[in-house]
């Protein structure tokens, strides 16, 4: 399987809400011993490998934000914890999954990574991620609503299986 990032850049005004999206592509194993986790975390540019470093989103770790199920199933975080931080992650039956961030501040700017992890027999881990940039702007140059920039075709299937 692969992860596609439809948009590589989101430019938003302060105070706005944004939904970052990724899509799980390709066949997924629906075996009884396979679990899929979909989650989000922050990272930084300038590394050898994008998304290799991980940091929390608004103090929430990837485990606080994850959805887990078998393959292309719908789910969303009902965690009070995430919602208290103005965050909600969700996924649908078509492999799309997202994180919504409410009331953006300049501190939310940075690199965001979506991640799909396949676990077999509750141990071995296979993972694929996608990356996108969020720029939160303030002042007269800020857009009135979020503007999204599509990924180039080679970025949009951001296959970084580890």
């Amino acid at each position: 399987f692969k992860v596609a990032t439809p948009y590589s850049l989101y430019v938003c005004p302060e105070g706005q809400n944004v939904t970052l999206t990724c899509r799980l592509l390709g066949p997924v194993d629906k075996g009884h011993d396979v679990t899929f986790y979909k989650t989000w975390y922050r990272s930084s540019r300038g590394e050898v490998q994008t998304c290799s470093e991980r940091r929390p989103i608004r103090n929430l770790t990837f485990q606080d934000l994850h959805l887990h199920h078998g393959g292309h199933q719908a789910a969303n975080t009902s965690h009070d914890l995430a919602q208290r931080h103005g965050l909600e992650s969700a996924s649908d039956h078509h492999g799309n999954f997202s994180i919504t961030m409410r009331n953006l501040t300049l501190l939310d700017s940075g690199l965001y990574c979506c991640l799909v992890v396949e676990i077999r027999h509750h141990h071995s881990e296979h993972r694929v991620h996608g990356a996108m940039e969020l720029q939160v702007q303030t002042g007269k140059d800020a857009p009135s609503n979020c503007v999204v920039y599509p990924s180039s075709s080679q970025d949009s299937e951001n296959i970084t299986a580890a």
Partner: antibody
């Protein structure tokens, strides 16, 4: 840079407990598992347990699940391993090590310098 | 539990020579989904903590000299040091991370 710094050597009597600390720096402590591995004199490496600091959830090697307790203090980015009911065969160097997994298992990319625990009457 | 067996226990090699270390697992550590071998190698010098050399059986950790190479798949793995330097004399451990964590007993590489 990413670093794990452990507490100093300990000498304990049989039956006592020991608590070893591991202070992390240079990365987001809450987002990476901390493992504990021991090495008896002249012996190989043996995995004891690991903990995810973000949640405090710990996972133990069956051999140690009744005697080892892992905890973290997020405010100081410090992980702890307490081993109870010590016996002479627990004499070893105890290492903390970071692994890069999300939900499964992974290799250990960063190690502490080790803490020598001696159990002797 | 997956058992890891390393051989030989001690390897005597002269500086500049090639060293070949073996590691065998009791079951395959190859993961079918990504065709990766969940095997790492560490170097440990006396009085020091282990240092990651190789992961995924053959990927060198950054900063590790290219005289170190890993190979093998499934249950049989090899760590090769192409031309031993004085700083390479140490104990080497293999480690599987497919199913929990287990280590081999180690191979000590000593000066001949």
């Amino acid at each position: 840079q990413v670093q794990l710094v452990q507490s100093g050597a300990e000498v304990k009597k049989p039956g006592a407990s020991v608590k070893v600390s591991c202070k992390a720096s240079g990365y987001s402590f809450t987002d990476y598992y901390i493992n504990w591995v021991r090495q008896a004199p002249g012996q190989g490496l043996e995995w004891i347990a690991r903990i995810f600091p973000g949640s405090g959830n710990a996972y133990y090697n069956e051999k140690f699940k009744d005697r080892a307790t892992l905890t973290v203090d997020k405010s100081t980015s410090t992980a702890y391993m307490e081993l109870s009911s010590l016996r002479s065969e627990d004499t070893a160097v105890y290492y903390c090590a970071r692994d890069d997994s999300f939900y499964g298992y992974w290799y250990f990319d960063v190690w502490g310098q080790g803490t020598t625990v001696t159990v002797s009457s | 539990n997956i058992m890891m067996t390393q051989s030989p226990a001690t390897l005597s090699v002269s500086p500049g020579e090639r060293a070949t270390l073996s590691c065998k697992s009791s079951q395959s550590v190859l993961y079918s989904s990504n065709q990766k071998n969940y095997l790492a190698w560490y170097q440990q010098k006396p009085g020091q903590s282990p240092r990651l050399l190789i992961y995924w059986a053959s990927t060198r950790e950054s900063g590790v000299p290219d005289r170190f190479s890993g190979s093998g798949s499934g249950t049989e793995f090899t760590l090769t040091i192409s031309s031993l330097q004085s700083e390479d004399f140490a104990v080497y451990y293999c480690h599987q991370y497919l199913s929990s964590y287990t280590f081999g007993g180690g191979t000590k590489v000593e000066i001949k």
